[in-house]
Amino acid sequence: MAVTACQGLGFVVSLIGIAGIIAATCMDQWSTQDLYNNPVTAVFNYQGLWRSCVRESSGFTECRGYFTLLGLPAMLQAVRALMIVGIVLGAIGLLVSIFALKCIRIGSMEDSAKANMTLTSGIMFIVSGLCAIAGVSVFANMLVTNFWMSTANMYTGMGGMVQTVQTRYTFGAALFVGWVAGGLTLIGGVMMCIACRGLAPEETNYKAVSYHASGHSVAYKPGGFKASTGFGSNTKNKKIYDGGARTEDEVQSYPSKHDYV
């Protein structure tokens, strides 16, 4: 039950995260005009990964797409690439994880296959989240660098009346959406990987022979975990899913795929 919950929650968290990554990628407010000394402005500029916009005092907004590939800064291209890779990996991860969900039955799919798919989707979510976080962080770093460069330009070498007040840009809403979404996708991926461990049918090592006094049996806890006897017991505490109380001899004598429902 806990595994199903962990897997389901991981899927939902990742789904929200990837939706957020898509939203952040499409948003126009990656960088917004810094209103450092003028909280009310007649012309407000903001920029996204795909276009830049200007909102006038009347509310009229005009956006212009970046209709060039070669003319764009390499960093912007890199951020675009990271976000797209994040979205693609996340989308594939979601597709894989749907089939991996324990609550969904697809034919006679083995639990081992579901476990592998859960792990795969988990890794994909982790990489997707890292791509988004990296993309947003690269853009944020670019903004910080440009911000201080433009600040330096504003206050040095002017020698009198300032002729051009350079527009400084600061963090836009998309950056925060991207960071949160990337984090959620990452968390969802980790949860999927944790759920995978619980789903994976771990084989008992049947070659080992345990020696103990005759008649001494090893009880099973109601939760399905082997009680540790300390003598000849499996100290790894491996989980079985039928929850039945059997002797260790019985477990060894009748290994069957039905031990793992």
Epitope: A42, V43, S52, E56, S58, V162, T167
Partner: antibody, heavy 120, light 113 residues
């Protein structure tokens, strides 16, 4: 036809207050910013402030903050400007003007102006 | 505040002549976000309110005769009347529409000889 109709001339005593109205017609009042401009006799134009009729949000020229108060009545599509603590410096013609929305913050329609004379 | 300086203070020309008036701003009115200049030109005839002629430094308002042309970028702007008509007798103002507070130039008075 778009029209901005302002009230007639006002003669007021120093220290008093006056409210100028600007009744609009021919367009959707809440869709355009309303601006107010002062023109002292034989002088240039001064922007007082503007108001967004939809939200009632105002932006003032710091020079006129406390002097002018901008309001709107959406039901009658009318903008108002109240001038308080009047002095001889406030004697001028006051215009209401509409922001042209997509015209790079330019004012495309103007009222005929209201002359305010402050005299004892 | 952005200071708008217009020159000359007054012009006296004959009808049919070409006239040019200048407007300079203390800060750039060019917006890099959309590559536009936020400057407007108004015409004010005696006893009338101002009338918009040019916005965005060079775009003619609808209904304005094509003899009126706006040009310039950044801090230097020009209004040109290619062939002055008698009805062009008026005061011409330029306006900073880029930053609050909006500011106007002192005006250029056009007189007909």
């Amino acid at each position: 036809e778009i029209q901005l109709q302002q009230t007639g001339p006002e003669l007021v005593k120093p220290g008093a207050s006056v409210t100028i109205s600007c009744k609009t017609s021919g367009y959707s009042f809440t869709d355009y910013l309303m601006l107010w401009v002062k023109q002292s006799h034989g002088k240039s134009l001064e922007w007082i402030g503007n108001i967004n009729p939809y939200y009632g949000r105002t932006t003032y020229n710091l020079k006129f903050k406390g002097k002018a108060t901008l309001t709107v009545d959406r039901s009658s599509s009318t903008a108002y400007m109240q001038l308080n603590s009047l002095t001889s410096e406030d004697s001028a013609v006051y215009y209401c003007a509409r922001d042209g929305y997509s015209l790079r913050n330019a004012m495309d329609y103007w009222g005929q102006g209201t002359s305010v004379t402050v005299s004892s | 505040d952005i200071v708008m300086t217009q020159s000359p203070y007054s012009l006296s020309v004959s009808t049919g002549e070409k006239v040019t008036m200048s407007c300079k701003s203390s800060q750039s009115l060019f917006n890099s976000g959309n590559q536009k200049n936020y400057l407007a030109w108004y015409q004010q005839k005696p006893g009338q309110p101002p009338k918009l002629l040019i916005y965005g430094a060079s775009t003619r308002e609808s209904g304005v005769p094509d003899r009126f042309t706006g040009s310039g970028s950044g801090t230097d702007f020009t209004l040109t009347i290619s062939s002055v008509q008698a009805e062009d007798l008026a005061l011409y103002y330029c306006q900073n529409a880029h930053s609050y507070p909006y500011t106007f130039g002192g005006g250029t008075k056009l007189e007909i000889k």
